[in-house]
């Protein structure tokens, strides 16, 4: 008689990424009997919560429940009802909430408290909401991409399962760019990590990893823009800021109170003779790049070498996956191809930034103006951060892979976070079982 497959024995997990600009819910699925195998967990759903990041719910936390409803209901639909009670739910908040906590622990705690009460109302196994550290964010992003790339598997394969695979076990570095922070994480080559804060030791699948990581708070793309505006308005002669990071013909009024609201601009704060100023775009990549470089203090380094602001950075080693906003921005600019050199990227950015705003709006009619207006800045910022901040060169640029998804799962910290909290990455290599007896009858 023909073998008949049993009902699939699967498990699910939910992670909410509460970022500075928005919240996303991810649903993961894996075969129950292969929990400790590498590469078996995959993403089955992403739901982007409508609205801003949770840190913006200060003064209206009573609206958080409604805000989360659609995506939590989507999770209810996707995950079979019989699995609801055993499906863990985790919420991790990142730099937007780190900044809020710096301003007021009470307000940050209140937001998280209401998030927890809202998520506890669902039939899942809610495991808590917390602000993860920048170090965790970097580490879990690194775990995610290497897990998905199969780098933790001890089996050598004669075939490649993912586009970036080089069939060796050397891990990829992780470059993550958010709205409020950016993370760099990699295994340096035989290099002592000179600052203990930046050192992580892992034992995964029987192998030891000494990992370097740093999270630069305030250097996500949105906070970097606020920093740049706060820096530049200091030297403006009046309430007009001619800004090379915006397209020619672009105009926008900014409230000074909005500019100084974030802790990221405190170092540039001064009493201005006006309450509003107008950004007038002039669209010049080179000048924009120069202005951005002023955000990176490279004059001081207490180590053998630094990234910027006196933060230790070992020599770059190996390939890097650049994800989150690194990917979204470069994808929009059509610059994610492996074949595009750094020089070509710079040329394309020069042309893009110089395009008149009216022309840009016509060419990208479907894109919200708020986002559209910032791609020139964001693209220039990415180049500045990678080249001058992290010391990539024209030659090492080819080692950066702009990655959105790997094997259908988003690159980001959420998968690594769940794998860790559900103990699905063993320290030792599990005994291999070629085929589980429960698979067929």
């Amino acid at each position: 008689t023909q073998n008949k497959a049993l009902p699939e024995n699967v498990k699910y997990g939910i992670v909410l990424d509460a970022g500075s600009s928005h919240t996303s819910l991810y649903i993961y699925k894996w075969p129950a009997e292969k929990e400790n195998d590498t590469g078996v967990v995959h993403q089955v759903e992403e739901c982007r919560v409508k609205g801003p990041g949770i840190s913006k719910f200060v003064q209206k936390v009573n609206e958080i429940g409604i805000y989360l409803t659609d995506c939590m209901e989507r999770a209810r639909e996707v995950i079979p009802r019989s699995q609801h009670q055993e499906t863990p739910v985790y919420l991790g908040a990142t730099a937007g909430m780190r900044l809020l906590r710096m301003e007021s622990e009470e307000l940050a705690d209140r937001v998280l408290d209401v998030v927890e009460r809202s998520l506890s109302n669902y039939p899942f196994d809610f495991q808590g909401a917390r602000i993860i550290t920048g170090q965790e964010e970097g580490a879990y992003g690194w775990i995610t991409i290497n897990y998905l790339l199969g780098k933790f598997s001890q089996k050598t394969r004669w075939f490649s399962i993912v586009p970036y695979e080089t069939n060796n076990q050397e891990t990829f570095g992780a470059l993550d760019l958010g709205g409020a922070s950016t993370q760099v994480t990699f295994v340096p080559q035989n290099q002592t990590i000179e600052s203990p804060d930046n050192a992580l030791q892992f034992r995964l699948y029987g192998k030891d990893y000494n990992v370097y990581t740093h999270s630069f708070l305030c250097y996500g793309k949105d906070q970097a823009l606020w920093q740049k505006l706060a820096k530049d308005i200091q030297v403006a002669s009046n309430e007009i800021l001619r800004d090379p990071c915006f397209h020619p013909g672009y105009k926008k009024v900014v409230n000074v109170s909005d500019l100084y609201k974030t802790p990221c601009t405190k170092r540039f704060e001064m009493t201005l003779p006006f309450q509003q100023f107008e950004i007038q775009g002039i669209g010049n990549y080179q000048q924009c790049h120069q202005s951005i470089l002023e955000l990176f203090n490279t004059s001081y380094c207490p180590y053998s070498q630094c990234a910027f602001n006196g933060i230790f950075l070992p020599p770059l080693q190996g390939d890097f996956g650049a994800f989150s906003a690194f990917y979204f921005v470069m994808k929009f600019l059509n610059l994610t191809s492996e074949k595009v050199s750094q020089e070509k990227v710079t040329e394309m950015m020069k042309k893009f930034c110089a395009q008149p705003w009216e022309e840009i709006k016509t060419s990208y009619a479907g894109v919200k103006e708020k986002y559209l207006s910032e791609y020139c800045f964001s693209g220039t910022y990415i180049l500045s951060l990678l080249l001058q901040g992290y010391h990539f060169t024209a030659d090492s640029w080819e080692h950066i892979h702009f990655i959105g998804k790997i094997q259908g799962s988003d690159a980001g910290w959420t998968l690594g976070y769940m794998l860790n909290l559900t103990n699905m990455i063993p320290a030792e290599q599990p005994l291999s079982t070629p085929l589980s007896h429960s698979t067929y009858v």
Epitope: V58, Q59, K60, N62, N255
Partner: antibody
């Protein structure tokens, strides 16, 4: 202690504009929203809306959309209410009231002393 | 909009009396109801929030109760300083609304 001090009475002609202020002290201004409430002579209280002092977001009751504008100057912990194209029926006392979080929702806990705006030709 | 209907609209009572003012909401507002006291020429003063919780400094003779659509404010033993107008207020749904007021006068 928490205090909301409003600007003094105003006498205006129809069609003119008025801007009244509400200066907060005794707490961190950007940690609490600010409501505005109107009370016409001999009448009850009407909620006009509120301003989020952290994000600048504005929420208006339908009857107060258009000629009524809430604004802020966080550097001096002050909220403002501006009314343009004044009409006789805008004659009222206008109150600011702090929006504070108590038991899972937001209430008006402290009130300014009120500003009387009289519109008369 | 949610209507808040207070009754009575005015009430005469004596010092030492127990007084109850009621407020009926046109829709369920949970316990998101507050009560305010206002004296002539003065700003309202916050007494009760979340239907039954007194603000600090508010005398214990003031108490609130109710949930859903029916709410009451009770003053257990009237004092001379309690003669004023009292307003109920719902903050469950935008636009927030107030009752029309109950004027409490000395008999």
């Amino acid at each position: 202690q928490v205090q909301l001090v409003q600007s003094g009475s105003e006498l205006k002609k129809p069609g003119a504009s008025v801007k009244i202020s509400c200066k907060a002290s005794g707490y961190t201004f950007t940690h609490y929203g600010m409501n505005w409430v109107r009370q016409a002579p001999g009448q009850g209280l009407e909620w006009m809306g509120w301003i989020n002092t952290y994000t600048g977001e504005l929420t208006y009751a339908d009857d107060f959309k258009g000629r009524f504008v809430f604004s802020l100057d966080t550097s001096v912990s002050t909220a403002y209410l501006q009314i343009s194209s004044l009409k006789a029926e805008d004659t009222a006392v206008y109150y600011c009231a702090r929006r504070a979080y108590y038991r899972y929702d937001y209430v008006m806990d402290y009130w300014g002393q009120g500003t009387l705006v009289t519109v008369s030709s | 909009d949610i209507q808040m209907t207070q009754s009575p609209s005015s009430l005469s009572a004596s010092v030492g009396d127990r007084v109850t003012i009621t407020c009926k909401a046109s829709h369920n507002v949970g316990t998101n109801v507050a009560w305010f006291q206002q004296k002539p020429g003065k700003a309202p003063k916050s007494l009760i929030y979340s239907a039954s919780y007194r603000y600090s400094g508010v005398p214990s003779r003031f108490s609130g109760s109710g949930s859903g659509t029916d709410f009451t404010l009770t003053i257990s033993s009237l004092q001379p300083e309690d003669f004023a107008t009292y307003y109920c207020h719902q903050y469950n749904n935008y636009p927030y609304t107030f009752g029309q007021g109950t004027k409490l006068e000395i008999k």
